[in-house]
Interface confidence: low
Protein backbone atom coordinates (compact mmCIF):
# COMPACT_ATOMS: atom_id res chain seq x y z
CA UNK A 1 0.00 0.00 0.00
CA UNK A 2 1.30 3.42 -0.99
CA UNK A 3 2.24 5.46 2.08
CA UNK A 4 3.15 8.73 0.34
CA UNK A 5 2.42 10.47 -2.94
CA UNK A 6 5.13 11.47 -5.44
CA UNK A 7 6.97 14.65 -4.54
CA UNK A 8 5.79 17.89 -6.17
CA UNK A 9 7.91 20.06 -8.43
CA UNK A 10 8.87 23.49 -7.03
CA UNK A 11 10.26 26.48 -8.91
CA UNK A 12 10.26 30.25 -8.86
CA UNK A 13 8.77 32.44 -11.56
CA UNK A 14 10.22 34.26 -13.28
CA UNK A 15 13.49 33.36 -11.56
CA UNK A 16 15.00 32.19 -8.28
CA UNK A 17 17.26 35.26 -8.21
CA UNK A 18 15.03 38.12 -7.14
CA UNK A 19 16.05 41.77 -6.85
CA UNK A 20 15.02 43.21 -3.51
CA UNK A 21 11.56 44.79 -3.39
CA UNK A 22 10.50 43.00 -6.58
CA UNK A 23 7.92 40.27 -6.72
CA UNK A 24 8.32 36.55 -7.22
CA UNK A 25 5.92 33.63 -7.36
CA UNK A 26 6.83 30.26 -5.91
CA UNK A 27 5.07 27.53 -7.87
CA UNK A 28 4.31 24.08 -6.55
CA UNK A 29 3.02 21.47 -8.98
CA UNK A 30 1.56 18.29 -7.53
CA UNK A 31 -1.36 16.19 -8.69
CA UNK A 32 -4.92 16.86 -9.74
CA UNK A 33 -7.18 16.19 -6.77
CA UNK A 34 -4.75 17.62 -4.22
CA UNK A 35 -6.86 19.37 -1.59
CA UNK A 36 -4.03 21.19 0.19
CA UNK A 37 -0.56 22.48 -0.60
CA UNK A 38 1.88 23.60 2.05
CA UNK A 39 4.89 25.81 1.42
CA UNK A 40 7.69 25.41 3.93
CA UNK A 41 10.41 28.01 4.51
CA UNK A 42 13.62 27.12 6.31
CA UNK A 43 11.95 23.97 7.61
CA UNK A 44 8.81 25.63 8.99
CA UNK A 45 5.35 26.08 7.54
CA UNK A 46 5.13 29.37 5.66
CA UNK A 47 1.86 29.29 3.73
CA UNK A 48 -1.07 27.03 2.87
CA UNK A 49 -3.23 26.94 -0.24
CA UNK A 50 -6.34 24.86 -0.84
CA UNK A 51 -7.14 24.81 -4.57
CA UNK A 52 -10.74 24.98 -5.72
CA UNK A 53 -11.82 22.83 -7.40
CA UNK A 54 -8.97 20.44 -6.57
CA UNK A 55 -9.78 17.99 -9.36
CA UNK A 56 -9.08 20.68 -11.99
CA UNK A 57 -5.94 22.22 -10.51
CA UNK A 58 -2.52 20.62 -10.16
CA UNK A 59 -0.41 23.69 -9.46
CA UNK A 60 -0.59 26.46 -6.86
CA UNK A 61 1.27 29.74 -6.64
CA UNK A 62 2.56 31.50 -3.55
CA UNK A 63 3.08 35.16 -4.34
CA UNK A 64 5.78 37.21 -2.61
CA UNK A 65 5.11 40.85 -3.49
CA UNK A 66 8.15 42.33 -1.79
CA UNK A 67 11.38 40.37 -1.89
CA UNK A 68 13.80 41.08 0.91
CA UNK A 69 16.45 39.29 2.92
CA UNK A 70 13.81 37.92 5.31
CA UNK A 71 12.16 36.04 2.45
CA UNK A 72 15.41 34.64 1.06
CA UNK A 73 16.25 31.07 1.94
CA UNK A 74 15.24 27.50 1.27
CA UNK A 75 11.67 26.64 0.33
CA UNK A 76 9.99 23.30 -0.23
CA UNK A 77 6.41 22.22 -0.71
CA UNK A 78 4.17 19.22 -0.11
CA UNK A 79 0.59 18.42 -1.04
CA UNK A 80 -2.21 16.22 0.22
CA UNK A 81 -4.81 14.08 -1.54
CA UNK A 82 -7.38 12.98 0.99
CA UNK A 83 -5.37 12.04 4.09
CA UNK A 84 -2.29 11.03 2.13
CA UNK A 85 0.65 13.45 2.02
CA UNK A 86 3.32 13.65 -0.67
CA UNK A 87 7.05 13.44 -0.27
CA UNK A 88 8.53 16.93 0.08
CA UNK A 89 9.71 18.63 -3.10
CA UNK A 90 13.35 19.36 -3.78
CA UNK A 91 14.65 22.46 -2.03
CA UNK A 92 14.28 25.77 -3.83
CA UNK A 93 16.92 28.33 -2.90
CA UNK A 94 15.38 31.78 -3.24
CA UNK A 95 18.08 34.43 -3.50
CA UNK A 96 17.64 38.17 -2.97
CA UNK A 97 19.91 40.27 -5.16
CA UNK A 98 20.69 43.98 -5.49
CA UNK A 99 21.87 44.11 -1.90
CA UNK A 100 24.34 46.82 -0.87
CA UNK A 101 27.03 47.16 -3.55
CA UNK A 102 28.02 46.49 -7.14
CA UNK A 103 31.12 44.43 -7.97
CA UNK A 104 33.47 45.02 -10.88
CA UNK A 105 34.10 42.26 -13.40
CA UNK A 106 37.16 42.16 -15.62
CA UNK A 107 38.64 39.53 -17.91
CA UNK A 108 42.25 38.64 -18.67
CA UNK A 109 43.82 38.75 -21.23
CA UNK A 110 40.80 40.59 -22.67
CA UNK A 111 37.25 40.25 -23.96
CA UNK A 112 38.36 39.09 -27.42
CA UNK A 113 40.42 35.92 -27.41
CA UNK A 114 41.33 33.07 -29.69
CA UNK A 115 40.08 29.54 -29.09
CA UNK A 116 42.58 27.72 -26.88
CA UNK A 117 43.74 30.79 -24.95
CA UNK A 118 43.58 30.69 -21.15
CA UNK A 119 41.04 33.15 -19.82
CA UNK A 120 40.49 34.31 -16.23
CA UNK A 121 37.66 36.48 -14.91
CA UNK A 122 38.23 38.70 -11.87
CA UNK A 123 35.34 39.83 -9.69
CA UNK A 124 36.11 42.59 -7.19
CA UNK A 125 33.99 44.04 -4.39
CA UNK A 126 35.48 46.27 -1.72
CA UNK A 127 32.92 45.56 0.97
CA UNK A 128 32.70 42.76 3.50
CA UNK A 129 32.17 39.63 1.50
CA UNK A 130 34.39 36.68 0.79
CA UNK A 131 32.32 34.69 -1.69
CA UNK A 132 31.76 35.63 -5.31
CA UNK A 133 29.64 34.13 -8.07
CA UNK A 134 30.27 34.25 -11.79
CA UNK A 135 27.31 33.66 -14.09
CA UNK A 136 27.09 33.31 -17.81
CA UNK A 137 23.77 34.52 -19.14
CA UNK A 138 21.60 31.91 -20.79
CA UNK A 139 19.35 29.02 -19.99
CA UNK A 140 22.06 26.49 -19.23
CA UNK A 141 24.01 29.09 -17.32
CA UNK A 142 27.01 27.96 -15.39
CA UNK A 143 27.42 29.44 -11.93
CA UNK A 144 30.89 29.32 -10.46
CA UNK A 145 31.89 30.15 -6.91
CA UNK A 146 35.08 31.95 -6.02
CA UNK A 147 36.57 33.10 -2.75
CA UNK A 148 38.79 36.00 -1.73
CA UNK A 149 38.87 38.99 0.60
CA UNK A 150 37.99 41.62 -1.97
CA UNK A 151 38.52 39.76 -5.24
CA UNK A 152 37.98 36.29 -6.62
CA UNK A 153 39.58 34.67 -9.64
CA UNK A 154 37.61 32.51 -12.04
CA UNK A 155 39.99 30.66 -14.38
CA UNK A 156 38.12 29.28 -17.37
CA UNK A 157 41.22 27.52 -18.69
CA UNK A 158 41.72 27.17 -22.43
CA UNK A 159 38.51 28.50 -23.93
CA UNK A 160 36.46 27.29 -26.88
CA UNK A 161 33.69 28.97 -28.82
CA UNK A 162 31.29 27.43 -26.28
CA UNK A 163 32.60 29.99 -23.76
CA UNK A 164 31.29 32.85 -25.87
CA UNK A 165 28.67 34.93 -24.14
CA UNK A 166 27.89 37.57 -21.60
CA UNK A 167 29.17 37.20 -18.05
CA UNK A 168 28.30 38.95 -14.82
CA UNK A 169 29.38 38.47 -11.26
CA UNK A 170 27.87 38.96 -7.82
CA UNK A 171 29.25 39.32 -4.34
CA UNK A 172 27.53 36.96 -1.95
CA UNK A 173 26.87 38.16 1.61
CA UNK A 174 25.46 34.76 2.44
CA UNK A 175 24.08 31.91 0.37
CA UNK A 176 20.80 33.74 -0.17
CA UNK A 177 21.78 37.43 -0.29
CA UNK A 178 23.74 38.65 -3.29
CA UNK A 179 24.96 42.05 -4.39
CA UNK A 180 23.85 44.00 -7.43
CA UNK A 181 25.11 42.32 -10.61
CA UNK A 182 28.30 43.69 -12.13
CA UNK A 183 28.28 45.39 -15.46
CA UNK A 184 28.29 42.73 -18.21
CA UNK A 185 31.46 41.54 -19.87
CA UNK A 186 30.97 40.00 -23.30
CA UNK A 187 33.54 37.33 -24.10
CA UNK A 188 34.19 36.85 -27.81
CA UNK A 189 36.05 33.68 -28.75
CA UNK A 190 37.14 33.28 -32.35
CA UNK A 191 37.75 29.72 -33.52
CA UNK A 192 39.62 28.03 -36.36
CA UNK A 193 38.76 29.01 -39.92
CA UNK A 194 36.10 26.28 -40.30
CA UNK A 195 34.54 27.19 -36.93
CA UNK A 196 34.21 30.93 -37.41
CA UNK A 197 30.45 30.84 -38.00
CA UNK A 198 28.68 31.66 -34.75
CA UNK A 199 26.98 28.65 -33.26
CA UNK A 200 23.53 29.49 -31.88
CA UNK A 201 23.87 30.52 -28.27
CA UNK A 202 21.78 29.18 -25.43
CA UNK A 203 18.43 30.91 -25.13
CA UNK A 204 19.13 33.94 -22.99
CA UNK A 205 17.27 36.54 -21.03
CA UNK A 206 16.31 39.35 -23.41
CA UNK A 207 19.55 41.23 -23.94
CA UNK A 208 18.43 44.48 -22.36
CA UNK A 209 16.61 43.08 -19.37
CA UNK A 210 19.23 41.47 -17.15
CA UNK A 211 18.98 44.41 -14.78
CA UNK A 212 15.26 43.75 -14.48
CA UNK A 213 15.32 40.02 -15.10
CA UNK A 214 12.67 39.51 -12.49
CA UNK A 215 10.17 41.26 -14.73
CA UNK A 216 10.74 38.98 -17.73
CA UNK A 217 8.13 36.28 -17.41
CA UNK A 218 8.36 34.13 -20.51
CA UNK A 219 5.95 31.25 -20.16
CA UNK A 220 7.90 29.18 -22.63
CA UNK A 221 11.02 29.46 -20.53
CA UNK A 222 9.54 28.41 -17.22
CA UNK A 223 10.70 24.82 -17.43
CA UNK A 224 14.04 26.04 -18.76
CA UNK A 225 14.31 28.35 -15.79
CA UNK A 226 13.66 25.42 -13.53
CA UNK A 227 16.46 23.44 -15.18
CA UNK A 228 18.69 26.49 -14.98
CA UNK A 229 17.75 26.96 -11.34
CA UNK A 230 18.59 23.34 -10.57
CA UNK A 231 22.07 23.74 -12.08
CA UNK A 232 22.68 27.00 -10.28
CA UNK A 233 21.28 25.87 -6.98
CA UNK A 234 23.46 22.79 -6.82
CA UNK A 235 26.27 25.28 -6.43
CA UNK A 236 24.48 26.96 -3.55
CA UNK A 237 24.43 23.79 -1.51
Amino acid sequence: QQQTLPKPFIWAEPHFMVPKEKQVTICCQGNYGAVEYQLHFEGSLFAVDRPKPPERINKVQFYIPDMNSRMAGQYSCIYRVGELWSEPSNLLDLVVTEMYDTPTLSVHPGPEVISGEKVTFYCRLDTATSMFLLLKEGRSSHVQRGYGKVQAEFPLGPVTTAHRGTYRCFGSYNNHAWSFPSEPVKLLVTGDIENTSLAPEDPTFPADTWGTYLLTTETGLQKDHALWDHTAQNLLR
Epitope: E21, Q23, L45
Partner: antibody
Protein backbone atom coordinates in the same frame (compact mmCIF):
# COMPACT_ATOMS: atom_id res chain seq x y z
CA UNK B 1 14.14 55.21 3.17
CA UNK B 2 10.72 53.58 3.18
CA UNK B 3 7.93 55.85 4.40
CA UNK B 4 4.15 55.64 4.57
CA UNK B 5 2.56 59.05 5.14
CA UNK B 6 -1.13 59.24 5.95
CA UNK B 7 -3.65 62.05 5.57
CA UNK B 8 -4.74 64.17 8.52
CA UNK B 9 -7.36 63.67 11.24
CA UNK B 10 -11.04 63.61 10.31
CA UNK B 11 -14.25 64.35 12.19
CA UNK B 12 -17.36 62.76 10.73
CA UNK B 13 -21.03 62.47 11.57
CA UNK B 14 -22.70 59.09 12.08
CA UNK B 15 -23.79 57.56 8.79
CA UNK B 16 -21.14 59.44 6.80
CA UNK B 17 -18.10 58.03 5.00
CA UNK B 18 -14.42 58.75 5.51
CA UNK B 19 -11.47 58.37 3.16
CA UNK B 20 -7.90 58.09 4.43
CA UNK B 21 -4.89 58.17 2.13
CA UNK B 22 -1.50 56.50 2.54
CA UNK B 23 1.35 57.80 0.36
CA UNK B 24 4.27 55.44 -0.08
CA UNK B 25 7.84 56.46 -0.84
CA UNK B 26 11.29 54.92 -0.75
CA UNK B 27 10.34 51.69 -2.54
CA UNK B 28 8.42 50.43 -5.56
CA UNK B 29 4.79 50.96 -4.60
CA UNK B 30 3.33 48.24 -6.83
CA UNK B 31 5.42 45.45 -5.32
CA UNK B 32 4.06 45.62 -1.79
CA UNK B 33 0.65 44.89 -0.36
CA UNK B 34 -0.78 47.71 1.73
CA UNK B 35 -2.73 46.60 4.79
CA UNK B 36 -5.07 48.67 6.94
CA UNK B 37 -5.25 48.21 10.70
CA UNK B 38 -7.27 50.23 13.18
CA UNK B 39 -7.03 50.88 16.91
CA UNK B 40 -9.74 52.36 19.07
CA UNK B 41 -8.53 54.48 22.00
CA UNK B 42 -7.02 52.26 24.67
CA UNK B 43 -7.82 49.14 22.66
CA UNK B 44 -5.87 46.59 20.63
CA UNK B 45 -5.08 46.32 16.94
CA UNK B 46 -7.67 45.13 14.42
CA UNK B 47 -6.87 44.15 10.83
CA UNK B 48 -9.30 45.52 8.25
CA UNK B 49 -8.02 44.38 4.87
CA UNK B 50 -5.32 44.82 2.27
CA UNK B 51 -4.86 45.85 -1.34
CA UNK B 52 -2.30 44.67 -3.86
CA UNK B 53 -1.33 47.97 -5.53
CA UNK B 54 -0.06 46.12 -8.59
CA UNK B 55 -3.29 44.32 -9.46
CA UNK B 56 -5.74 46.45 -7.47
CA UNK B 57 -7.20 43.32 -5.90
CA UNK B 58 -8.33 43.77 -2.31
CA UNK B 59 -9.20 41.39 0.50
CA UNK B 60 -11.41 42.47 3.39
CA UNK B 61 -12.02 41.31 6.91
CA UNK B 62 -15.47 39.76 7.23
CA UNK B 63 -16.26 42.36 9.86
CA UNK B 64 -15.90 45.23 7.36
CA UNK B 65 -17.22 43.50 4.23
CA UNK B 66 -19.69 45.74 2.43
CA UNK B 67 -18.65 49.06 3.92
CA UNK B 68 -14.86 49.06 3.43
CA UNK B 69 -13.37 49.92 0.05
CA UNK B 70 -9.63 49.84 -0.61
CA UNK B 71 -8.31 51.51 -3.74
CA UNK B 72 -5.01 52.78 -5.10
CA UNK B 73 -3.57 55.35 -7.43
CA UNK B 74 -0.31 53.96 -8.76
CA UNK B 75 0.57 57.21 -10.50
CA UNK B 76 0.60 58.87 -7.07
CA UNK B 77 2.00 55.86 -5.15
CA UNK B 78 -0.99 56.20 -2.84
CA UNK B 79 -3.45 53.74 -1.29
CA UNK B 80 -6.86 54.76 -0.03
CA UNK B 81 -9.19 53.39 2.62
CA UNK B 82 -12.84 54.38 2.54
CA UNK B 83 -15.18 53.32 5.34
CA UNK B 84 -18.88 54.06 4.97
CA UNK B 85 -21.92 54.04 7.28
CA UNK B 86 -19.81 55.29 10.16
CA UNK B 87 -20.90 54.76 13.74
CA UNK B 88 -19.42 55.95 17.02
CA UNK B 89 -17.68 52.55 17.38
CA UNK B 90 -15.58 53.45 14.30
CA UNK B 91 -13.81 56.20 16.22
CA UNK B 92 -10.21 55.02 16.09
CA UNK B 93 -6.73 55.59 14.75
CA UNK B 94 -6.40 54.03 11.30
CA UNK B 95 -3.00 52.80 10.13
CA UNK B 96 -1.68 51.64 6.80
CA UNK B 97 1.15 49.10 6.95
CA UNK B 98 3.31 47.39 4.38
CA UNK B 99 3.75 43.77 3.32
CA UNK B 100 3.31 40.45 5.17
CA UNK B 101 5.02 41.30 8.43
CA UNK B 102 3.80 44.93 8.65
CA UNK B 103 7.42 46.06 8.59
CA UNK B 104 6.61 49.74 7.95
CA UNK B 105 3.59 51.63 9.26
CA UNK B 106 2.03 54.99 8.55
CA UNK B 107 1.88 57.48 11.40
CA UNK B 108 -1.84 56.87 11.87
CA UNK B 109 -4.97 58.92 11.15
CA UNK B 110 -7.46 59.68 13.90
CA UNK B 111 -11.06 59.40 12.72
CA UNK B 112 -13.63 60.73 15.17
CA UNK B 113 -17.31 59.92 14.61
CA UNK B 114 -19.53 62.25 16.57
CA UNK B 115 -22.87 63.92 16.15
CA UNK C 1 -10.45 33.13 12.64
CA UNK C 2 -7.41 32.23 14.70
CA UNK C 3 -7.55 33.70 18.20
CA UNK C 4 -4.35 35.00 19.80
CA UNK C 5 -4.19 35.16 23.59
CA UNK C 6 -1.42 37.11 25.28
CA UNK C 7 -0.39 36.93 28.90
CA UNK C 8 -0.03 38.75 31.12
CA UNK C 9 -2.16 41.70 30.06
CA UNK C 10 0.15 43.96 32.05
CA UNK C 11 3.27 43.66 34.15
CA UNK C 12 5.47 45.89 36.28
CA UNK C 13 9.23 45.56 36.06
CA UNK C 14 12.42 47.44 36.80
CA UNK C 15 15.26 48.47 34.53
CA UNK C 16 17.59 45.49 34.12
CA UNK C 17 14.88 42.89 34.71
CA UNK C 18 14.34 39.94 32.41
CA UNK C 19 10.81 40.11 31.03
CA UNK C 20 8.86 37.31 29.34
CA UNK C 21 5.56 37.70 27.48
CA UNK C 22 3.69 34.71 26.13
CA UNK C 23 1.28 34.36 23.25
CA UNK C 24 -0.94 31.37 22.51
CA UNK C 25 -2.72 30.65 19.22
CA UNK C 26 -6.08 28.87 19.12
CA UNK C 27 -4.65 26.50 16.50
CA UNK C 28 -1.22 25.64 15.18
CA UNK C 29 0.39 28.45 13.21
CA UNK C 30 3.87 26.95 12.76
CA UNK C 31 6.29 29.88 13.13
CA UNK C 32 4.08 32.46 11.41
CA UNK C 33 4.16 34.94 14.29
CA UNK C 34 5.35 38.53 14.66
CA UNK C 35 5.88 40.73 17.72
CA UNK C 36 5.37 44.50 17.78
CA UNK C 37 6.17 47.25 20.27
CA UNK C 38 3.88 50.27 20.54
CA UNK C 39 4.40 53.45 22.51
CA UNK C 40 1.57 55.90 23.30
CA UNK C 41 0.58 58.00 20.30
CA UNK C 42 2.88 56.09 17.96
CA UNK C 43 2.44 53.38 15.36
CA UNK C 44 3.50 49.82 16.24
CA UNK C 45 7.07 48.83 15.43
CA UNK C 46 8.06 45.37 14.19
CA UNK C 47 10.48 43.60 16.55
CA UNK C 48 10.38 39.91 15.64
CA UNK C 49 9.03 38.05 12.63
CA UNK C 50 8.78 34.33 11.85
CA UNK C 51 8.61 33.74 15.65
CA UNK C 52 12.33 34.18 16.28
CA UNK C 53 13.93 36.35 13.62
CA UNK C 54 15.04 39.78 14.82
CA UNK C 55 14.00 42.69 12.62
CA UNK C 56 16.89 44.78 11.34
CA UNK C 57 17.85 47.53 13.79
CA UNK C 58 16.13 45.96 16.78
CA UNK C 59 18.40 45.54 19.84
CA UNK C 60 19.57 41.99 20.52
CA UNK C 61 18.10 42.04 24.03
CA UNK C 62 14.80 41.21 22.31
CA UNK C 63 14.33 37.57 21.33
CA UNK C 64 11.46 35.38 20.27
CA UNK C 65 10.86 31.66 20.46
CA UNK C 66 8.16 29.07 19.96
CA UNK C 67 6.36 27.19 17.23
CA UNK C 68 2.91 25.73 16.78
CA UNK C 69 0.66 27.33 19.37
CA UNK C 70 2.93 28.68 22.12
CA UNK C 71 5.27 31.62 21.67
CA UNK C 72 7.44 33.80 23.87
CA UNK C 73 8.92 37.27 23.61
CA UNK C 74 11.83 37.85 25.97
CA UNK C 75 13.57 41.10 26.87
CA UNK C 76 16.81 39.98 28.50
CA UNK C 77 17.56 43.23 30.32
CA UNK C 78 14.79 45.81 30.35
CA UNK C 79 15.84 49.32 29.34
CA UNK C 80 13.97 52.60 30.04
CA UNK C 81 12.91 52.87 26.39
CA UNK C 82 11.33 49.39 26.50
CA UNK C 83 8.35 50.47 28.61
CA UNK C 84 5.54 50.10 26.09
CA UNK C 85 2.74 47.79 24.95
CA UNK C 86 3.68 44.62 23.08
CA UNK C 87 1.46 42.75 20.62
CA UNK C 88 1.79 39.37 18.97
CA UNK C 89 0.23 38.75 15.56
CA UNK C 90 -0.24 35.61 13.48
CA UNK C 91 0.23 35.74 9.73
CA UNK C 92 -0.48 32.04 9.16
CA UNK C 93 -3.89 32.67 7.67
CA UNK C 94 -6.18 35.48 6.62
CA UNK C 95 -7.36 37.42 8.49
CA UNK C 96 -4.16 38.16 10.39
CA UNK C 97 -5.06 38.51 14.05
CA UNK C 98 -3.41 40.21 17.01
CA UNK C 99 -3.14 39.38 20.68
CA UNK C 100 -4.83 41.84 23.03
CA UNK C 101 -1.50 43.36 24.10
CA UNK C 102 0.78 43.33 27.13
CA UNK C 103 1.57 46.64 28.83
CA UNK C 104 5.03 46.75 30.40
CA UNK C 105 5.10 49.41 33.14
CA UNK C 106 7.77 50.76 35.47
CA UNK C 107 7.71 49.20 38.92
Amino acid sequence: QVQLVQSGAEVKKPGASVMVSCKASGYTFTTNNIHWVRQATGQGLEWMGYINPGSGKAKYSQRFQGRLTLTKDTSADTAYMELSSLGSEDTAVYYCARTYYFDYWGQGTLVTVSS
Amino acid sequence: DIQMTQSPSSLSASVGDRVTITCRASQGISNALAWYQQKPGKAPKLLIYAASRLESGVPSRFSGSGSGTDFTLTISSLQPEDFATYYCQQHYSTPPTFGQGTKVEIK
